[in-house]
């Protein structure tokens, strides 16, 4: 028995930040779980982790240097990533493990979300004016 995960196929991070919502076919209310976001086709980099516990507030952390936060819904976890770099454009996969109460459940691998990080647009300097309007 596997949890199904839905993600947006693609997101664009215009200001180096993005909200990625992971929607699950499972209600996380009153469960103890570990939701995580992984970068790359091989999911080699664990970008962000959200630990949910029925009796404590959400624990959110990254061991890989990402600036992240998390928000919990009944059947979703939203990861808010900030200070992304252009070279962090990649495919990102949501993962969920429900530990308690048993039985242990995890998800079928999702299709992932391509996060396209656009560089910050700098205001044109007066010495180097941008293209003039017609």
């Amino acid at each position: 028995n596997k949890i199904l995960v839905k993600q947006s196929p693609m997101l664009v991070a215009y200001d180096n930040a993005v909200n990625l919502s992971c929607k699950y076919s499972y209600n996380l209310f009153s469960r103890e779980f570990r939701a995580s976001l992984h970068k790359g086709l091989d999911s080699a980099v664990e970008v962000c982790v959200v630990y949910g516990n029925y009796s404590q507030q959400l624990q959110v952390y990254s061991k890989t240097g990402f600036n992240c936060d998390g928000k919990l819904g009944n059947e979703s976890v939203t990861f808010y990533l900030q200070n992304l770099y252009v070279n962090q454009t990649d495919i990102y996969f949501c993962k969920i493990e429900v530990m308690y109460p048993p039985p242990y459940l995890d998800n079928e691998k999702s299709n992932g979300t391509i996060i396209h990080v656009k560089g910050k647009h700098l205001c044109p300097s007066p010495l180097f004016p941008g293209p003039s309007k017609p």
Epitope: E32, R34, Y54, E97, M99, Y100, P101, P102, P103, Y104, D106
Partner: antibody, heavy 120, light 111 residues
Framework: EVQLVESGGGLVQPGGSLRLSCAAS??????????VGWIRQAPGKGLEWIGE???????YYSPSLKSRVTISRDNSKNTLYLQLNSLRAEDTAVYYC????????????WGQGTLVTVSS | DIQLTQSPSSLSASVGDRVTITCRAS??????????LHWYQQKPGKAPKLLIY???SLQSGVPSRFSGSGSGTDFTLTISSLQPEDFATYYC?????????FGQGTKVEIK
């Protein structure tokens, strides 16, 4: 046949660290369906759950020990490890690893245990 | 944390006696009709051995004189006819919530 064999116990100084091993055979630590936990028993006392590791590598710890404990594994050796830091006399115990199934989380196979004595 | 309280802490019995040990949880350990409460037997110098899982299911290889019952917060381990090899300490354990917790144990001694 499922077997769990702990090693690494002995005398440790207060403030020191211990690293215990649990060699598993008869099943794979990285295959779904089962996980492995660590449980300890102080001399003449009851059983205390330390933490566990799932096939995915995710770990779960007892809140009272979380700041001092790390459970890890080496899939190539099918071996589990328990690292416990800042040891004190109260950590003196027999340390067991035990396998649990994912449906009920009952510990169906146990190692023989390894004794750790924390003393100067 | 879920506290498990076993009673009695110790008991003296004779071979052939019917023995009952109770385990009370500080909150329900039931979920979707399953009680996540297990019983173990431990002999001196040995590792615990699983006897009963999910409150009433007999672990493979365990003699049928052992049985478990109960749901919610109140559970019972019964040994229908005590045998010499049954003198040991018995523990209940819950796996409904983390941290997993054990009862303090019940020592069954020879009368």
């Amino acid at each position: 046949e499922v077997q769990l064999v702990e090693s690494g116990g002995g005398l440790v100084q207060p403030g020191g660290s211990l690293r215990l091993s649990c060699a598993a055979s008869g099943f794979s630590l990285s295959t779904g369906g089962v996980g492995v936990g660590w449980i300890r028993q102080a001399p003449g006392k009851g059983l205390e759950w330390i933490g566990e590791i799932y096939h995915s590598g995710s770990t779960y710890y007892s809140p009272s020990l979380k700041s001092r404990v790390t459970i890890s594994r080496d899939n190539s050796k099918n071996t589990l490890y328990l690292q416990l830091n800042s040891l004190r006399a109260e950590d003196t115990a027999v340390y067991y690893c035990a396998r649990y199934g994912y449906y009920y989380y009952d510990f169906d196979y146990w190692g023989q245990g390894t004794l750790v004595t924390v003393s100067s | 944390d879920i506290q498990l309280t076993q009673s009695p802490s110790s008991l003296s019995a004779s071979v052939g006696d019917r023995v009952t040990i109770t385990c009370r949880a500080s909150q329900s350990v039931d979920f979707h009709g399953i009680s996540f409460l297990h019983w173990y037997q431990q002999k001196p110098g040995k590792a615990p051995k699983l006897l009963i899982y999910a409150a009433s299911s007999l672990q493979s290889g365990v003699p049928s004189r052992f049985s478990g019952s109960g749901s919610g917060t109140d559970f019972t381990l019964t040994i229908s006819s005590l045998q010499p090899e049954d003198f040991a300490t018995y523990y209940c354990q819950q796996s409904y919530r983390s941290p997993r917790t054990f009862g303090q144990g019940t020592k069954v001694e020879i009368k």
